[in-house]
Amino acid sequence: LQDPCSNCPAGTFCDNNRNQICSPCPPNSFSSAGGQRTCDICRQCKGVFRTRKECSSTSNAECDCTPGFHCLGAGCSMCEQDCKQGQELTKKGCKDCCFGTFNDQKRGICRPWTNCSLDGKSVLVNGTKERDVVCGPSPADLSPGASSVTPPAPAREPGHSPQ
């Protein structure tokens, strides 16, 4: 014999107090699947948590974090403090990246600069706390008399023909 509750769609619950009639979820609750005997209470995004998506009868609210914080954990269950670019969050708070490392985001850890020489390249732009190094052509390509590097074409403004 089929369970009459299996006919209750998402957004409703099977109301035992009313002969297993499918009743709509009450305000501030939801059921995301059919056949539910209760509706779940909607998550409330309070304090550091901001509402990213409102609760509906069929889906829970979704939260994110207020500026200065970023989400951690499943479903943004926590908000972790941001640091500045060029820093990482340690047990003692935000600390500057050590020399030779960088962080170009407000979260996460400082990562070592790229070692250009591993790819046989030279450093074109030095790294900083906030930015990785930029690797350029290989040192051999830069040696005098090397013909393999094509010099860049002179820059022209659009609409002007070369003199």
């Epitope: 948590f49 269950s77 926590m78 908000c79 403090q81 003692k92 708070g93």
Partner: nanobody
């Protein structure tokens, strides 16, 4: 071991003020966000306020905004809740609670340590 001890509760008339304190020990207080949570007679737990580890970010339940102020003194390992313009509906046991991860604000379900609470009664 972690200990949180609240004080400062009592009987106050409507419109009056109280300052709650929470003395913390057993962990690096300055690295953790802290909260105040309350439980009115016969009701469930209600989040009241959060403060981040450094004290520069504070958050409040709508019903207490503009009346309550959370603060902390990291040198004294103490959390405070200044409560002004108190109403009968503020009557509750007030708990301080510690958040589980350094420099992180969690939801109430995830707080890992709670004090024993201090009773605030607002009545004429």
């Amino acid at each position: 071991q972690v200990q949180l001890v609240e004080s400062g509760g009592g009987l106050v008339q409507p419109g009056g003020s109280l300052r709650l304190s929470c003395s913390a020990s057993g962990f690096t207080f300055s690295s953790y966000a802290m909260s105040w949570v309350r439980q009115a007679p016969g009701k469930g737990l209600e989040w009241v306020s959060d403060i981040n580890s450094g004290g520069e970010s504070t958050f409040y339940e709508d019903s207490v905004k503009g009346r309550f102020t959370i603060s902390r003194d990291n040198a004294k390992n103490t959390l405070y809740l200044q409560m002004n313009s108190l109403k009968p509906e503020d009557t509750a046991v007030y708990y301080c609670a510690k958040h589980p991860l350094t420099f992180t604000i969690a939801t109430m379900n995830d707080y890992d340590y709670w004090g024993q609470g201090t009773l605030v009664t607002v009545s004429s």
